[in-house]
């Protein structure tokens, strides 16, 4: 069971300091951006991190949304990352959900975060280069010190 708590506005970066944004095709991508680029591209660079109370504490449960014309929420349905047009629900009556990720700091590094899927144990949000694009994907990882599954989250509130 997940119950919605408060939300915060955040900028998410990979460890190469590239900024996560949602492109015109609703794809989550990373790009080099100056602070002014980041502001100019808002709200596509501003993510709503919705925190949830978890009936089985396993880290901070979050849903990640973005509000452009409508609110879209990050999903890892079938292990594929996409933004679905939906509001994060107030309650989820299950211990797993395709929109819930566990946000945890990397041991010894409070500013570096990992996001593990609640639906797929051992699968993490990751940044991966595909041709010329840096994409946000869901990746099964058993080397947890890999920088591709680490992110920084800068609060904008």
């Amino acid at each position: 069971y997940f119950g919605k708590l408060e939300s915060k506005l955040s900028i998410i970066r990979n460890l190469n300091d590239q900024v996560l944004f949602i492109d015109q095709g609703n794809r989550p991508l990373f790009e080099d951006m100056t602070d002014s680029d980041c502001r100019d591209n808002a709200p596509r660079t501003i993510f709503i991190i919705n925190m949830y109370k978890d009936s089985q504490p396993r880290g901070m449960a979050v849903a990640i949304s973005v509000k452009c014309e409508k609110i879209s929420t990050l999903s890892c349905e079938n292990r594929i990352i996409s933004f679905k047009e939906m509001n994060p629900p107030d309650n989820i009556k299950d211990t797993k959900s395709d929109i819930i990720f566990f946000q945890r700091s990397v041991p010894g590094h409070d500013n570096k975060m990992q996001f593990e899927s609640s639906s797929y144990e051992g699968y993490f949000l990751a940044c991966e280069k595909e041709r010329d694009l840096y994409k946000l994907i869901l990746k099964k990882k058993d080397e947890l010190g890999d920088r591709s599954i680490m992110f920084t989250v800068q609060n904008e509130d």
Epitope: P57, R58, G59, R104, G108, H109, E121, D142, E143, G145
Partner: antibody, heavy 126, light 107 residues
Framework: QVQLVQSGAEVKKPGASVKVSCKVS????????FHWVRRRPGKGLEWMGR????????KYAERFKDRVTMTEDTSTDTAYMELSSLRSEDTAVYYC???????????????????WGQGTLVTVSS | DIQMTQSPSSVSASVGDRVTITCLAS??????LTWYQQKPGKAPKLLIY???KLQDGVPSRFSGSGSGTDYTLTISSLQPEDFATYYC?????????FGQGTKLEIK
Amino acid sequence: QVQLVQSGAEVKKPGASVKVSCKVSGEISTGYYFHWVRRRPGKGLEWMGRIDPEDDSTKYAERFKDRVTMTEDTSTDTAYMELSSLRSEDTAVYYCTTWRIYRDSSGRPFYVMDAWGQGTLVTVSS
Amino acid sequence: DIQMTQSPSSVSASVGDRVTITCLASEDIYTYLTWYQQKPGKAPKLLIYGANKLQDGVPSRFSGSGSGTDYTLTISSLQPEDFATYYCLQGSKFPLTFGQGTKLEIK
């Protein structure tokens, strides 16, 4: 309690291949990997590689990658490690081990080698 | 590759002694470090994971500490059954790498 039972000792000639098996008995959760580790006489533990039973993807240590093949038969819960072009320096005890997530009190994951096979002695001698 | 430098390579001690073994990683391994004990003719046995978390069933005289690149295994009061070889293992990145091992012998 998970147990790993390995095949018996082998004596091989230089240039030959050896295939060691590792059978899982007992209840094992999903989301584990098989790793292979060896210990040569008078030396320390050495990681050889791993296989993911979910998709058969492998990662090998650079020094073994041209000679080692790790496979897994999900229907029999058995992992295999084949080492080819054997030389005398490959004389060692070979271990299979499971690589699984353990979690701390905040749910943070850590992978550990928890269950180990009893070891298989491979002797390479002419 | 991440290098794990373990020291000392061997140590002689008596029952009741306090023993410390260290592992130095060539880069930050984010506490993805485990400690194993191996006795002759036996498979390694997990003692500590996540640098400082005691595996179930392991006596509390064993403890681990460290972060970043520096890690320590401490046995607070040696018992006769503790004489064995100890290894650290970094699980941060492939290839996984073990320390060279520390042989703990009776003085």
